[in-house]
Interface confidence: low
């Protein structure tokens, strides 16, 4: 069943799956001035066994302007920081995706993929939230939101997550302000657990984040 | 893979009905396109049918159109024809197939874009 809405938006923070359960879709966008090939396919679709998920299909683009870019590659290191995505240090490894039974990893880039990623998630799907650089989280609630089927409708649970500038005081009674890391960021944006429900595991937020939205749009 | 095992077809009479079905079995085929294709003795195996991986679009040989009709069950792993108002010209051997590209924005009335096939299953209309 695919949630009908997008994640909730947080000010000043954005979200990310760490996973993508069996049944979501990705839209095979390409970027301007590249186009789907012709009888390629709109999605990907996360699919699988008991055993084994995976993303069925690949996304291709080929020019606009002409008809013979098909080739599947890995973008090269230019072609990627075109993507939207902000890189975050962390001390450790984020959930290994591949050990989620009826989940999938983080599909590759494709050539000439378009720079924001439009997922179409299913109930049960749980996305995690980080302030974005620049902001430290000020509630230490659960920092994630899932979508959950109630009444036979689809709603995203609210995370509890406040992200506030660096420059602002304002603090929880006791709470010191944060050291920044070698990177120059906050220690807040950098080492936020969270625990996951979903996989009953402690994890730290993932070491890629997007800063694009994804959007549930079904056509 | 994508496994399929068609059933339902037999002898009928001219203006009769059947309805064949098409079992598939393999972690993909919700993701493709579906067709019927037969092949009449003598014949080049011709299209007759198709539905989409969403079962938004549907296609139809201009012979069937009116006549027959395709639906699939996601749930079920099922694809079935309805064929309605029998033609002796009906006769042959009906196959179900699945298009060879994933979530296939396109409905493709050629075979040589269906990767996979079952064993066919024969339909004969007496007149």
């Known amino acids: 069943e695919l949630c009908d809405d997008d994640p909730p938006e947080i000010p000043h923070a954005t979200f990310k799956a760490m996973a993508y359960k069996e049944g979501t879709m990705l839209n095979c966008e390409c970027k301007r001035g590249f186009r789907r090939i012709k009888s390629g396919s709109l999605y990907m679709l996360c699919t699988g066994n008991s055993s084994h998920s995976s993303w069925d299909n690949q996304c291709q683009c080929t020019s606009s302007a002409t008809r013979n870019t098909t080739k599947q590659v890995t973008p090269q290191p230019e072609e990627q920081k075109e993507r939207k995505t902000t890189e975050m240090q962390s001390p450790m490894q984020p959930v290994d995706q591949a050990s989620l039974p009826g989940h999938c990893r983080e599909p590759p880039p494709w050539e000439n993929e378009a720079t924001e990623r439009i997922y179409h998630f299913v109930v049960g799907q749980m996305v995690y939230y980080q302030c974005v650089q620049g902001y430290r989280a000020l509630h230490r609630g659960p920092a994630e939101s899932v979508c959950k089927m109630t009444h036979g409708k689809t709603r995203w649970t609210q995370p509890q997550l406040i992200c506030t500038g660096e420059m602002e005081t304002s603090q929880f009674p006791g709470e010191e302000k944060p050291q920044a890391s070698p990177e120059g960021r906050p220690e807040s944006e950098t080492s936020c657990l969270v625990t996951t429900t979903d996989f009953q595991i402690q994890t730290e937020m993932a070491a890629t984040m997007e800063t694009s939205i994804f959007t549930t749009e079904y056509q | 893979q994508v496994q399929l095992v068609e059933s339902g077809g037999g002898l009928v009479q001219a203006g009769g009905s059947l309805r064949l079905s098409c079992a598939a079995s393999?972690?993909?085929?919700?993701?493709?396109?579906m067709g019927w294709f037969r092949r009449a003795p003598g014949k080049e195996r011709e299209f007759v049918a198709a539905?989409?991986?969403?079962?938004?679009?549907?296609l139809y040989a201009g012979s069937v159109k009116g006549r027959f009709t395709i639906s699939r069950d996601n749930g079920r792993n099922m694809v079935y024809l309805q064929m309605n108002s029998l033609k002796p010209e009906d006769t042959a051997v009906y196959y179900c197939?699945?298009?060879?590209?994933?979530?296939?924005?396109?409905?493709?009335?050629?075979?040589?874009?269906?990767?996979?096939w079952g064993q066919g299953t024969q339909v004969t209309v007496s007149s």
């Open positions: 197939a699945a298009d060879n590209i994933p979530l296939s924005s396109d409905m493709r009335p050629t075979a040589t874009e269906y990767d996979y």
């Open positions: 393999g972690g993909t085929f919700r993701t493709r396109n």
């Open positions: 539905v989409s991986w969403n079962v938004d679009n549907k």
